[in-house]
Interface confidence: medium
Amino acid sequence: FERTRSLQDPCSNCPAGTFCDNNRNQICSPCPPNSFSSAGGQRTCDICRQCKGVFRTRKECSSTSNAECDCTPGFHCLGAGCSMCEQDCKQGQELTKKGCKDCCFGTFNDQKRGICRPWTNCSLDGKSVLVNGTKERDVVCGPSPADLSPGASSVTPPAPAREPGHSPQ
């Protein structure tokens, strides 16, 4: 057991938030400011991500975890870990290389980001369209036409969804 311990890498004892300092006889030193190590046994600390420009800090960097960014008002995240920010569009639009464009007929987008998606095809499920789709909203499918024969239970269509006002965040 003693032999195994003596062969063990002394750096493996360094916990997250520290690094194994070769310049100081492999002592575990705390990560310097603006750096972190998320796992033990690291020989260096990683530089913290800086949320600058169109990015803003969602979570501060600590000695054991990197900073996390999101986007400043009017922009939204794209990519893994919010690697990019792009301008918001309106609901009912998608961002193209030429700016925000209205969704084509038959498609919708109910968010300020992302792409226009096709309306649900109710007939694929043997249902009928209860509420028509718009650029901002998908269609609402109801019971199949056969279910609407006299004597069948009536279905009250939902109240149309109101587009939320773009009030401050």
Partner: antibody, heavy 118, light 107 residues
């Protein structure tokens, strides 16, 4: 070069509405947002709202009930309308472009002075 | 709303001096702060965004620093054309808010 120019009425009666047009050149409203900011001796610079490239708007909660911002991309114009003006709405009103790098104002119009008085 | 406080309304300086204008946010705004210069009768002009990034065409004697709640705009080797009002703005959250401004005057 990038330019923004506000045109407004100058004098507005109390309780009436204020309409200002911001005409831009040197950039496209399809790509850039435009902010509205006002400046008065008593309150300094106040951010009123913004219209983004896609036409979505964000307003200062203090003005949301009486403010609307719209635009016409083809005419390169942004329209500002504020209702129910009172004396303390007297200010210089600016439009300013939002760059693609942050939620700030990189180019400003020269401003239009608005006095609310009967 | 986030309050941006510029405690010094006026600062006196001489040409060639180095001067620091400060701004304090009422809560953490990261580095989401911009600085503007405004001369009498003119509209504001962007100098710095993201606390320390100079806007294009801004002379390198203007430098911004700070993060969290405390921010500084430093003008080294002040020129006569720098005599103006300097305003900070936070854009970490809506509503965007400005400081009341600091006027730079000649001693």
């Amino acid at each position: 070069q990038v330019q923004l120019q506000e045109s407004g009425p100058g004098l507005v009666q109390p309780t009436q509405s204020l309409s200002i047009t911001c005409t831009v050149s040197g950039f496209s409203l399809i790509s850039y947002g435009v902010h509205w900011v006002r400046q008065s001796p008593g309150k300094g610079l106040e951010w009123l709202g913004v219209i983004w490239s896609g036409g979505s708007t964000d307003y200062n909660a203090a003005f949301i009930s009486r403010l609307s911002i719209s635009k016409d991309n083809s005419k390169s114009q942004v329209f500002f309308k504020m209702n129910s003006l009172q004396a303390d709405d007297t200010a210089i009103y600016y439009c300013a472009r939002n760059p693609l790098t942050a939620t700030v104002m990189d180019y400003w119009g020269q401003g239009t002075s608005v006095t609310v008085s009967s | 709303d986030i309050v941006m406080t510029q405690s010094q309304k006026f600062m006196s300086t001489s040409v060639g001096d180095r001067v620091s204008v400060t701004c304090k946010a009422s809560q953490n705004v990261g580095t989401n702060v911009a600085w503007y210069q405004q001369k009498p009768g003119q509209s504001p002009k962007a100098l710095i965004y993201s606390a320390s990034y100079r806007d294009s065409g801004v002379p390198d004697r203007f430098t911004g620093s700070g993060s969290g709640t405390d921010f500084t705009l430093t003008i080294s080797n002040v020129q006569s054309e720098d005599l103006a009002e300097y305003l900070c703005q936070q854009y970490n959250s809506y509503p965007l808010t400005f400081g009341a401004g600091t006027k730079l005057e000649l001693k």
